[in-house]
């Protein structure tokens, strides 16, 4: 796995332990919490990051994600089960044997059940809407400049191919970034839109996951773009299965 050779760190994930014990003495990094070897040339999967976050000391700063998400991430943080590739397992259970099914970004998509609950497949989240509100500025940002800057950010910082950034909408002070990535579109080596959205979310909250890199400094034509609120909505390839009782509550 590629990691910084000089001081053996993982540029894309600071929640790792690295040592020069890879093939030929190369630097190898393992995610905290799971011990899974990670590829430091790309984003680490959200499942491994969430697991690492839960393994961190309890007094560490951990902000629960907002609970207004569309496919609602009301459950906030939990210690997930990840498969050998670092993806969320379709079924997640807690220590009290309460289980539920999740999508590819780890958000619950069924009612909670017991150990008999079956989750046949990991359903892919193929459309993510990142809804931002920026702090007041002297005037509105130029839409095309804003669009170009956000596309540049996702391409350069998160290495997400621009074809997966479907649109950037802007009505001051609200910015919406639409990410779309069907199973058929995602080639080997492509960054997952869910992972890019998670890294972006942590960046805008000032909790960057990148090693040693400065925090996110978003500027549009030199004017700082400061985000004061983030909501993320997830749409799955197969609609979620919640009971009517929950939907009418």
């Amino acid at each position: 796995h590629t990691a910084a050779q000089d001081n053996c760190t993982c540029p894309t994930n600071k929640m790792t332990v690295c040592s020069p014990d890879g093939p030929g003495g190369r630097c190898q990094c393992r995610a905290l919490g799971s011990g899974v070897a990670v590829d430091c040339s790309t984003l680490t999967s959200e499942c491994l990051l969430l697991k690492a976050r839960m393994s961190a000391p309890k007094n560490a700063r951990t902000l629960v994600r907002p609970n207004e998400h569309a496919l609602v991430d009301n459950d906030g943080l939990y210690d997930p089960d990840c498969d050998p590739e670092g993806r969320f397992k379709a079924r997640q259970c807690n220590q009290t044997s309460v289980c539920w099914c999740v999508n590819s970004v780890g958000v619950r998509r069924t009612d909670k059940g017991d150990l008999s609950l079956r989750c046949d497949e990991l359903v892919r989240t193929h459309h993510i809407l990142i809804d931002l509100r920026h702090r007041p500025t002297a005037g509105a940002f130029n839409h095309s400049d804003l669009d170009a800057e956000l596309r540049r950010l996702f391409r350069e910082r998160y290495r997400l191919h621009p074809k997966f950034v479907a649109a950037v909408h802007y009505e001051q002070p609200t910015i919406q970034i639409e990410l779309r990535q069907n199973t058929s579109q995602k080639a080997a080596g492509d960054v997952d839109i869910g992972d890019a959205a998670y890294y972006f979310e942590r960046d805008v909250k000032g909790e960057s996951l990148f090693q040693g890199r400065g925090g996110l400094d978003l500027r549009v034509r030199g004017e700082p773009l400061q985000v004061e609120r983030t909501l993320i909505y997830y749409l799955d390839e197969i609609p979620p299965k919640f009971s009517m009782k929950r939907l009418t509550a």
Epitope: T2, P11, A148, R152, R155, K163
Partner: antibody, heavy 119, light 108 residues
Framework: QVQLQESGPGLVKPSGTLSLTCAVS?????????WSWVRQPPGKGLEWIGE???????NYNPSLKSRVTISVDKSKNQFSLKLNSVTAADTAVYYC????????????WGQGTLVTVSS | DIQMTQSPSTLSASVGDRVTITCRAS??????LAWYQQKPGKAPKLLIY???SLESGVPSRFRGSGSGTEFTLTISSLQPDDFATYYC??????????FGQGSRLEIK
């Protein structure tokens, strides 16, 4: 085997427009790749001009942005470069290249075509 | 722009020698670096990408290393075919993509 072939006038008058086309074979121009132009003045180093991804907006080197246009013709499996208001400083060998990755490194190149700007 | 600086600009060596070319970036580019070989009158040829990954068909005597701001291209045992100009290129940023000024490897 992927092959790229540049074509266009070898001589352009100052203040005129340089126009080149790159024909792609062995790969679809609509594939998951970037298509770039790179130039090399005689005896000098390489300079990236810009790129295009079919279905996306082109990106240009800021130093040339005001003068350059890159476009794609999917039906002919080719892409083109237009550079206007040329001067002698634009005399160079112009290469078209296929870019791999989210941001390009260049795995296939055309053989290059020398464009001289002179009256 | 990210500036790429190569050294030396010219180096003289003999067949069988081990040679090293260095490329420095003006800011950290992670491992997003490629190396090319160019012979007179020919297009550049990709040797190395992602700082250390050998392009298919390139002889194993070519080796790339480094990350962040400092990178090296090493040719372990020079062959007659290796005398050429070598360029590094960063692809951390596309605004713009930039190359080093080149390092000419000549026969001593």
């Amino acid at each position: 085997q992927v092959q790229l072939q540049e074509s266009g006038p070898g001589l352009v008058k100052p203040s005129g427009t340089l126009s080149l086309t790159c024909a792609v074979s062995g790969d679809s121009i609509s594939s998951n790749n970037w298509w770039s132009w790179v130039r090399q003045p005689p005896g000098k180093g390489l300079e990236w001009i810009g790129e295009i991804y079919p279905g996306g907006n082109p990106n240009y080197n800021p130093s040339l942005k005001s003068r350059v246009t890159i476009s794609v013709d999917k039906s002919k499996n080719q892409f083109s470069l237009k550079l206007n208001s040329v001067t002698a400083a634009d005399t160079a060998v112009y290469y078209c290249a296929r870019g791999s990755g989210v941001i390009s490194y260049f795995d296939y190149w055309g053989q290059g075509t020398l464009v001289t700007v002179s009256s | 722009d990210i500036q790429m600086t190569q050294s030396p600009s010219t180096l003289s060596a003999s067949v069988g020698d081990r040679v090293t070319i260095t490329c420095r970036a003006s800011q950290s580019i992670g491992h997003w670096l490629a190396w090319y070989q160019q012979k007179p009158g020919k297009a550049p040829k990709l040797l190395i990408y992602k700082a250390s990954s050998l392009e298919s068909g390139v002889p194993s005597r070519f080796r790339g290393s480094g990350s962040g701001t400092e990178f090296t291209l090493t040719i372990s045992s020079l062959q007659p075919d290796d005398f050429a100009t070598y360029y590094c290129q960063q692809y951390s940023s596309y605004s713009p993509i930039t190359f080093g000024q080149g390092s000419r490897l000549e026969i001593k």
